[in-house]
Each structure stands twice: as C-alpha cells, then as structure tokens.
Interface confidence: low
C-alpha cells in the first residue's frame, strides 16, 4: 500500500486495522452462494425469496417489527455486524473505499472464476447502500498486483 | 440523480379500489425503501407504508392496515401502492417517496432512521359517488 | 407512537427576519428527526435530516438543532421564497409527521 500522509489517511488507516471486516467477507460469500443455489429462479418472488426466514433462520424480515424497536433491520448476523463495522467508514468515502478494497483483496483467492468474481465484486459495490450508507462515488476493486487507481 | 414520476390523475367510486404507480429513473431502485406518504384537503402530510425493493418487504401504518397494499416491480424500477374500500375521505394527494434509510447498529441490531430525500410529483385521487 | 407537536401554526414574518419554528416529540427519537418545506402545487423537499444535517442543495440560511424530544428549524434570514408549509418527521418509532407550521411572508 501506499504511504499515508495526511493526517486523514493516517486515521482512515488505523480505522482499517482496527475494523473487523470479517463479517462482511464471510455475509457476501454466503450471500452469491446462496444466488448461485437459486440461479434459475425468481429470486424476489415471495415463495421462492433466498433471503426468506424459511431459508435462512438467522434472517429476519429487515423491516419488520423487533424485540427491540420496529426498525429492527437486523438481515443475517454478519451483516448486521459487517454494517456495524462499514458505519465507522461513514463520513470518509475514501475509507470506505478502502475498505471495499480490502474486502476484495482477502477474498479474491477464495473465489471462483471469472463469473464469480464479477458477483462478488457487485454485491460489494451494493454492499454500504444495503447498510444504508453512502457508497463511494468512485472506487476502484480490480485485484491487481500494481498499485490500484486512489480515490 | 434518481427521478420518481407517477402515474396520473384518478377519480374512483366509493367502496372501489385504486392503483397508483411511481417509477423511478436515473439511479438504484432496489436498495432503498420507497415510502408513499398522503395528503388529503387542508390536511398534513400522513406516512401509509414502505417496500424495500430489494427485500419485497413491506410495512404499513395502522391507520392503513388490511387496505393498502404496496408492491414493487424491480424489472421496471416501479413501485405500486393500491388502496382500496375507498371513501370518501380517501380523496388526497398521494406521494411517494425515496426513503434514504441510513443504518445504525447497536448490540448486534441494526436500526434506520428515515429521511425522504426525493419525491414524486403527487397523484391526485378523487373519490366521489 | 410518537407524537410531532409544531409550533407556532402560523408565523407571520418580513423578509431578512428570523424564522424560528419548533417541533416537539412525545418521547424521545435522539437525533432522529428530518424537516421538509411544503409549497402548494409541489412535492415536499427534504431540508435537514438527522437533525441538524442540510440535505444536498439546500442553502445555509436553513439550520436544524436538538435531540431527544426538542427539536428547532431556524431560517437565519427570510426569502420571499421561503414561503410554505414545514413538516417535522421523525422516522424511530413507526414514522410520523407534525401537523405543520405555515410560515407567511408579509
């Protein structure tokens, strides 16, 4: 990486290591595993929804009335905790690309394929609006082993 | 920048129902909750319900319950809100509205608070016998 | 649910003046809490969000402040165009709006 030499850089940095992004990793693995499994369907359709509480009993309905306040958005664990964990990148949409980039970079070994990598790469451009964040207006996620194209 | 437009003006009957769509154009559909609010004459604005087009999940108002049905088409980046058992005092302004939906989470349970950053030009509905 | 009450209903003010309006919750909704100006004929157009937040494009003579359940729209200095009606809205609890405060240009 890079030298980092402003003070905000410095602080985007310390935030990276101390982030856990883990949870982001492990809920879009899941996640085009699971489109891949239902490849085929309707993926929306009310009986057929991968993301379906029938399907995956960590998911709860995201909007519906919780135990704790009726915007409970609580999806699958991970991504409650990979939002937790994006949410620190909020304010600084350079961090947040960073982050993006790091995710990618620690899972591009694990996928599959070209195909894979695409689906992959897509759920995580979608991946802060999912959380409700700002998603970085440019940020580039190509595993190169060159330097990479900075915000 | 993302564009909502709905369809036109309708004039119902009591007891009949209604359908008015709202298409979204130049941005991401999916993602964020679209709310349809109402206004009727003289009155404020009322929040009716939300789908998350990326979910195909749904709440409604109370006030609301068992009449309004909203429902989203993420082929045609279009929403739909049907209301039916009209009276009379259903005769309103009918908004939607992007929800921008910015998440918090506490305690492993992520929550949002809303924030309705672009809106419809409004569909007038008459219900009148 | 909780319960947006706006006041005044009606201001009546000059151009250059000072708008204060207020809205208050029926408990509390932290920072929660978004403002809109309504013009007849139009849609509404988000202000602030997040309390104190001024949406894309809105000019800075609009201010939002407070937590909890008191929350205040301050306009530094009154446009003509600032004529309309402004809603509060608050979005933790199953979402609400207040009934409204119509700020008059004389």
């Known amino acids: 990486r890079q030298q980092w030499e402003l003070q905000g850089d410095r602080r985007c940095q310390s935030q990276l290591e101390r982030a856990n992004l883990r949870p982001c990793e492990q809920h879009l693995m899941q996640k085009i595993q699971r489109d891949e499994d239902s490849y085929g369907r309707d993926p929306y359709s009310p009986s057929q929804d991968p993301y379906s509480p029938s399907q995956d009993p960590d998911r709860r309905d995201p909007y519906s009335p919780s135990p704790y306040d009726r915007r409970g958005a609580g999806s699958s664990q991970h991504q409650e905790r990979c939002c937790n964990e994006l949410n620190e990148f909020e304010n600084n949409q350079r961090c947040m690309c960073e982050a993006l980039q790091q995710i990618m970079e620690n899972q591009s070994d694990r996928l599959q394929g070209r195909q894979q990598e695409q689906q992959f790469k897509r759920e995580l451009r979608n991946l802060p609006q999912q959380c409700g964040l700002r998603a970085p207006q440019r940020c580039d996620l190509e595993v190169e082993s060159g330097g990479r194209d900075r915000y | 920048q993302v564009q909502l437009v709905q369809s036109g003006a309708e004039v119902r009957k009591p007891g009949s129902s209604v359908k008015v769509s709202c298409k979204a154009s130049?941005?991401?559909?999916?993602?964020?909750?679209i709310t349809w609010v109402r206004q009727a004459p003289g009155q404020g604005l009322e929040w009716m319900g939300w789908?998350?087009?990326?979910?195909?999940?749904?709440n409604y108002a109370q006030k609301f319950q068992g009449r309004v049905t909203i429902t989203a088409d993420e082929s045609t980046s279009t929403a739909y809100m049907e209301l039916s058992s009209l009276k009379s005092e259903d005769t309103a302004l009918f908004y939607c509205?992007?929800?921008?939906?910015?998440?918090?989470?506490?305690?492993?349970?992520?929550?949002?608070?809303?924030?309705?950053?672009?809106w419809g030009q409004g569909t007038l509905v008459t219900v009148s016998s | 649910e909780t319960v947006l009450t706006q006041s005044p209903a009606t201001l009546s003010l000059s151009p250059g003046e000072r708008a204060t309006l207020s809205c208050r919750a029926s408990?509390?909704?932290?920072?929660?809490l978004a403002w809109y100006q309504h013009k007849p004929g139009q849609a509404p157009r988000l202000l602030i969000y997040?309390?104190?937040n001024r949406a894309t494009g809105i000019p800075a003579r609009f201010s939002g402040s407070g937590s909890g359940t008191d929350f205040t729209l301050t306009i530094s200095s009154l446009e003509p165009e600032d004529s309309a009606v402004y809603y509060c809205?608050?979005?933790?609890?199953?979402?609400?709006f207040g009934g409204g405060t119509k700020v008059e240009i004389k």
């Open positions: 509205a992007r929800d921008r939906a910015h998440a918090y989470c506490n305690n492993g349970v992520c929550y949002t608070t809303d924030a309705f950053d672009v």
């Open positions: 130049g941005g991401t559909f999916s993602n964020n909750p």
């Open positions: 789908i998350i087009p990326i979910f195909n999940t749904t």
């Open positions: 408990q509390s909704v932290g920072r929660y």
């Open positions: 997040d309390a104190s």
């Open positions: 809205q608050q979005g933790t609890d199953w979402l609400t």
